[in-house]
């Protein structure tokens, strides 16, 4: 099923570049070209609870000692996604050596719950975002971002980690999502598909978008991610689609420009500090939030999830670009880095805005509204 | 109601030091973002020095790095600025500023304290 | 620094007229833009966060509007209580910094 031709005010209508006349249903792709729910998770790029590993390495985070005992993120190792017979080219994965389950991919065994078993947890991530169920909560107000831009130096770590490439943020980057929830940010990745199909973690209404960034926060209430994972609001990620655009994303491709540079599994370039926030949405007060969990092993919960309404235009050719440059291990490409939604079981998502009119193409059926739980301002 | 109140202000020498004081009450001191904001004689308004809700993160203008520093007691509720090595463009009004809860807009100021650096 | 450019300096109006006051940030600051008033002799007031949220209680004669690098502060029926000092402030990136502040006079 695809998506009606979506007006700017309904929900994920237009994108930050600021056109009013987002792409209509000729120009998304169909619901057909994702995968079934069974098919490989991709990752969320945090390390592991204990010895497991997380979805991307982090950066060492201290903020509140500099103790020399602090765990080193990208000394995790890794671990293995479940395979689809069906998808025999998305197995990008990372081996570390020395380690039983020391690597995980897109693809393959073992099961997920057999590395970690929160990966079989009942609130789990990504999900299937539907705008007429989600519950209008007018106390989700704004986000606020600070120190996101960024001067060229010191420049940026970017890597291929061989399931996607991520982009190391420096300290001083923080971000507030309401009362007693203040983070800073640690990193940002990507997660996309491959040609003609698309590849975002989230879906809205059961559309998969082409691609989605993740910026990924540790709450200042923990000095380091690992005693932040599982923990509720421990960990905060800011998601946002990726959609095709007329136009080249300047932004966008100042990382997209250096990929090449990176082809290879395990590589990495610094790049010059640039605008975190000329990534993401302009519009910071539509979106929807709810509890989810990290989308790679350990799959550990208590993850904020906030998802902007508003999506990122690329161009066609840049949207190629991060598709079809980085390789995993071996001869495989790296393409389709996600994990399929999972059932939401009771949970319910929160809409900074009513997102229920005019946007869902079951409209016309009788739905039943949820009531919002976040507290006020 | 939520009411900042500072003291500590007052005339000191080129050179010379004061502690700024903002008491707190009327909301849950520990949970806000607190900041100072100056204003010299019929200009505008400079942020000095602001602090997260634990104090674990901190901001100072450039100008007042090293001879400024801001802090906190959420047990005592109450916001500080130590200031020395005082300058004469130090004089300003001083005020204590809340932030919106888990926000960085401020929301709430106080009525401010007057600090003159003068020989 | 981020460099928040006020205009105009001051102006003077007639009760009932709508008054712009503009504030334009050196490079793109997002939403995070605050507006205040300051009366005379008075603390600085909230107005509008995040570029167009009004706080509860402001009338709602104010309203922000803007985003990335321009942003305006209207007063849509100018009320004599109105006279004050207003500043636009960015706290997308420290330092966080205000506008050279609209001195709005009541004909």
């Known amino acids: 099923q695809r998506l009606p031709r979506m007006q700017e005010d309904s929900p994920l209508g237009g994108g930050s570049s600021g056109e009013d006349d987002p792409l209509g249903e000729e120009d998304l792709p169909s619901e057909e070209d994702s995968p079934r729910e069974e098919d490989p998770p991709g990752e969320e790029d945090l390390p592991g609870e204990e010895d497991l590993p997380g979805e991307e390495d982090l950066p060492e985070v201290k903020p509140k000692s500099e103790e020399e005992g602090s765990l080193k993120l990208e000394d995790l190792p890794t671990v293995e996604a479940p395979g689809d017979p069906q998808e025999p080219q998305n197995n990008a994965h990372r081996d570390k050596e020395g380690d039983d389950q020391s690597h995980w991919r897109y693809g393959g065994d073992p099961p997920w719950p057999r590395v970690s078993p929160a990966c079989a947890g009942r609130f789990q991530s990504p999900v299937d975002i539907r705008p007429q169920l989600a519950a209008f909560c007018p106390a989700l107000r704004p986000l606020e971002l600070l120190g996101f831009q960024l001067p060229p130096l010191p420049e940026l770590r970017l890597r291929n980690n061989g399931h996607s490439v991520q982009l190391t943020l420096p300290p001083g980057l923080e971000m507030a999502l309401g009362p007693g929830r203040e983070y800073r940010a640690l990193q940002l990745h990507l997660h996309w598909g491959a040609a003609g199909r698309p590849g975002s973690e989230h879906t809205v209404e059961g559309h998969r978008f082409p691609a989605e960034i993740h910026v990924v926060h540790l709450s200042t209430a923990f000095a380091r991610v690992d005693e932040a994972l599982g923990r509720p609001g421990g960990l905060a990620v800011l998601a946002a689609f990726l959609e095709e655009g007329p136009e080249e994303n300047s932004a966008y491709e100042q990382l997209l420009s250096r990929l090449e540079e990176i082809a290879e599994e395990g590589s990495e370039t610094q790049v010059p500090g640039l605008d975190i926030s000329a990534l993401l949405p302009s519009d910071f007060s539509r979106y929807f939030q709810y509890e989810g969990s990290l989308t790679t092993p350990p799959c550990a919960q208590g993850v904020i999830w906030t998802v902007f309404n508003q999506t990122v235009m690329l161009s066609a050719k840049q949207l190629h670009t991060l598709s079809d440059t980085l390789w995993g291990p071996g001869d495989s490409r790296l393409q389709l880095n996600f994990r399929a939604t999972q059932p939401l079981n009771g949970r319910v998502i929160e809409a900074s805005f009513p997102a229920g009119v005019d946007s869902s193409p079951r409209a016309a059926e009788p739905v039943q509204l949820n009531s919002c739980l976040a507290a006020g301002d | 109601d939520v009411k900042l109140v500072e003291s500590g202000g007052g005339l000191v020498k080129p050179g010379g030091s004061l502690r700024l004081s903002c008491a707190a009450s009327?909301?849950?001191?520990?949970?806000?973002?607190m900041s100072w904001v100056r204003q010299a004689p019929g200009k505008g308004l400079e942020l000095v020095a602001a602090?997260?809700?634990?104090?674990?993160?901190?901001y100072y203008l450039d100008t007042v790095k090293g001879r400024f520093t801001i802090s906190r007691d959420n047990a005592k509720n109450t916001l500080y600025l130590q200031m020395s090595s005082l300058k004469s463009e130090d004089t300003a009004l001083y005020y204590c500023?809340?932030?919106?809860?888990?926000?960085?807009?401020?929301?709430?100021w106080g009525q401010g304290t007057s600090v003159t650096v003068s020989s | 620094d981020i460099q928040m450019t006020q205009s105009p300096s001051s102006l003077s109006a007639s009760v009932g007229d709508r008054v712009t006051i503009t504030c334009k940030a050196s490079?793109?600051?997002?939403?995070?833009v605050a507006w205040y008033q300051q009366k005379p002799g008075q603390a600085p007031r909230r107005l509008i966060y995040?570029?167009?949220n009004r706080y509860t209680g402001v009338p709602d004669r104010f309203s922000g509007s803007g985003s990335g690098t321009d942003f305006t502060l209207t007063i849509s029926s100018l009320q004599a209580e109105d006279l004050a000092d207003y500043y636009c402030?960015?706290?997308?990136?420290?330092?966080?910094?205000f506008g050279g502040g609209t001195k709005v006079e009541i004909k």
């Open positions: 500023a809340r932030h919106r809860s888990g926000y960085f807009s401020m929301d709430y």
């Open positions: 009327g909301f849950t001191f520990s949970n806000y973002y």
């Open positions: 602090i997260n809700s634990d104090g674990g993160i901190t």
């Open positions: 490079q793109n600051v997002v939403s995070a």
């Open positions: 995040s570029a167009s």
């Open positions: 402030q960015q706290y997308s990136n420290y330092p966080w910094t």
